[in-house]
Interface confidence: low
């Protein structure tokens, strides 16, 4: 999946299986990524687990779990708030669009989480105070999470180089250049560009991610994934000058 | 990841020696610190394991319930803007404890927010 870190680095990661996205003293988010196509290096998020840890008189421990085709509007115990404590309503789940868009407000830690299902896969976005981000007891282990450190270098795909390469090939099919050589129904480059431009008129990294995803999978839902990811940034990012990220040299992790 | 071993050792250590409300609290706190130490030792191999994270929060919960010393290496740090868990009067009277921004404004200006997102392939 494409990752925008807390420090506004933008990476495309091929991490497969379960990985910690956020892991601090108040919150643990784990994602499971699966290959989008057989033999593909590119992966997308198929499962998401969020643990809100027991906190003072505010919330009991609550676990939220979403999977492909299952985006519940409740915690796994069926509740929609933080439990029986005095401040239980400082943790709330709201269903924005049934089965497609859920928002979780954790006011006790100043945090908002947006989870969406777009096509077959999940997207995740969070707004969190720096103080909570850095509330890590054991930096050796907890400090390794993806939102903070990014993905390991050997797990990154240089999709900007791929994008440049794709542009040079014109309208020809890009099966050979694609990370998924067997990708069915992939788009010609011009079609991918046109579809992404419709939703993402600014040629930023979200637009480039959209083009990459269409060329890799042929799944037009990834256009919406990039579009909603940018919409979530608009809602959640505190610095309105940093909504759009543009091409740059690939960042090293951590 | 040996987190269930840590749990088991803690259950064994606390099941036959002291009541939560008794004067033996230092003993119970010592068992909690041993438990915390066990979880720290296994932390590297438990990364991403949810039982581990649940245990860590459980230790924090018990430490505050039993007023165990929090200044040792095994106590879990808390947000500086929120009152300590032991401050039950403030905790029960003030809804601000459970509202980060309100309690933050008491101490400083607006908190700095950050964003992380994951999408697509």
């Amino acid at each position: 999946p494409h990752l925008r870190t807390f420090t506004d680095r933008f990476q495309t990661c091929k991490v497969q299986g379960a990985w910690p996205l956020i892991d601090n003293n108040y919150l643990n988010v784990q994602v499971t990524n699966t290959p989008v196509l057989p033999g593909s290096a590119a992966t997308a998020t198929s499962k998401l687990t969020i643990i809100f840890k027991n906190f003072q008189e505010c919330v009991d421990q609550k676990v939220y779990q979403a999977e492909m085709d299952e985006l519940p509007a409740a915690f796994v115990d069926g509740s929609k708030n933080g439990g029986d404590k005095h401040g239980a309503n400082s943790l709330k789940i709201t269903e924005k669009v049934s089965g497609q868009h859920v928002e979780i407000q954790a006011k006790y830690i100043g945090t908002t989480i947006v989870v969406r299902q777009v096509g077959r896969y999940l997207t995740f976005a969070v707004r969190m105070p720096e103080e909570v981000v850095n509330a890590v007891e054991d930096w050796d282990s907890q400090g390794l999470y993806l939102c903070l450190r990014g993905c390991p270098l050997n797990q990154q795909i240089d999709f900007q180089a791929f994008h440049t390469n794709a542009e040079g090939t014109g309208a020809r099919r890009l099966a050979a250049a694609s990370p998924a050589p067997t990708a069915p129904e992939t788009f010609p480059y011009e079609t991918a560009v046109a579809k992404c431009k419709e939703k993402l008129p600014v040629e930023d990294l979200y637009y480039q991610a959209c083009v990459f995803d269409l060329l890799t999978t042929g799944d037009v839902n990834f256009t919406l994934a990039a579009y909603y990811a940018l919409e979530d940034v608009k809602m959640l990012h505190s610095n309105k000058d940093k909504l759009h990220l543009y091409e740059r040299t690939r960042d090293l992790p951590g | 990841c040996k987190i269930l071993k840590c749990n088991s050792e803690f259950w064994s250590a606390t099941s036959g020696s002291h009541a939560p409300a008794s004067d033996d609290t230092p003993e119970f706190c010592a068992a909690l610190r041993s438990y915390a130490l066990c979880t720290r030792r296994t932390a590297r191999t438990c990364r991403g394991d949810l039982a581990y994270h649940s245990a860590v929060h459980g230790i924090e919960d018990l430490m505050s319930q039993h007023n165990c010393s929090k200044d040792g290496p095994t106590s879990q740090p808390r947000l500086r803007t929120l009152p300590p868990a032991g401050d039950s009067q403030e905790r029960s009277d003030s809804p601000e404890i459970c509202h980060y921004e309100k309690s933050f404004h008491k101490h400083s200006a607006t908190p700095n927010y950050t964003h992380c997102g994951l999408f697509g392939d």
Epitope: T49, Q61, V63, Q65, V76 | C1, K2, I3, L4, K5, N7, S8, F10, W11, S12, T14, S15, G16, S17, H18, A19, P20, S22, Y35, D49, L50, A51, S54, A55, H57, G58, I59, D61, L62
Partner: antibody
Framework: EVQLVQSGAEVKKPGASVKVSCKAS????????ISWVRQAPGQGLDWMGW????????NYAQKLQGRVTMTTDTSTSTAYMELSSLRSEDTAVYYC?????????????WGQGTLVTVSS | QSALTQPRSVSGSPGQSVTISCTGT?????????VSWYQQHPGKAPKLMLY???KRPSGVPDRFSGSKSGNTASLTISGLQAEDEADYYC?????????FGGGTKVTVL
């Protein structure tokens, strides 16, 4: 929804063995221990032991040591309880139950139960 | 024979309070924070009602409460309702073994 679904009823002869399965869904299987509890007809609950699906560690009731074996298969999120050298007094409903995470010890989710009848 | 002793039965009228005791030794109850309570309706699996002596899982009505004094743990049902008629078991983790009480039948008159 967190669920534990157990295998169907069994009828066994004395001296035989029985293996009951318990398939977990709706949560991360390796994050919780699994306990086994039995209940003879008209009697109370009897704790048999627990297993950590993560590590395979087990803790059996002393009176069942040597006769009971608990295992898990993490690839299918299934726990198994095998009881050997069956006697008529082993006739009971056998339950699997999820052990709450963290330091607390309690059983928060239960299977529907499996009736094992030992009869010659 | 269970090492945790519960009364065989208790009864009360709707709206009344009933208390079930669970008495053990200092090692099984007195010194243990791992006391939990389970409700079982006939032919059904048990259901967790309280854990860690006093904590109530979400979904359990607040008329169920727990306490402990010395070597006795107690479950109190205040405002008894017809659906509370069931068997109730206490459980305590005590070192190597986990012990259930013998069970108490609660009858709503």
């Amino acid at each position: 929804e967190v669920q534990l679904v157990q295998s169907g009823a069994e009828v066994k002869k004395p001296g035989a063995s029985v293996k009951v399965s318990c398939k977990a869904s709706g949560y991360t299987f390796t994050s919780h221990g699994i306990s086994w509890v039995r209940q003879a007809p008209g009697q109370g609950l009897d704790w048999m032991g627990w297993i950590s699906p993560y590590s395979g560690n087990t803790n059996y009731a002393q009176k069942l040591q040597g006769r009971v074996t608990m295992t898990t298969d993490t690839s299918t999120s299934t726990a198994y309880m095998e009881l050997s050298s069956l006697r008529s007094e082993d006739t009971a409903v056998y339950y699997c139950a999820r052990v709450g995470s963290g330091p607390y010890y309690y059983m928060d989710v239960w299977g529907q139960g499996t009736l094992v009848t030992v009869s010659s | 024979q269970s090492a945790l002793t519960q009364p065989r039965s208790v009864s009360g009228s709707p709206g009344q309070s009933v208390t079930i005791s669970c008495t053990g030794t200092s090692s099984s109850v007195g010194d243990s924070i791992y006391v939990s309570w389970y409700q079982q309706h006939p032919g059904k699996a048990p259901k967790l009602m309280l854990y860690d002596v006093t904590k109530r899982p979400s979904g359990v009505p607040d008329r169920f409460s727990g306490s402990k004094s010395g070597n006795t743990a107690s479950l109190t049902i205040s405002g008894l309702q017809a659906e509370d008629e069931a068997d109730y078991y206490c459980l305590s983790y005590a070192g190597t073994d986990t012990l259930f009480g013998g069970g108490t039948k609660v009858t709503v008159l």
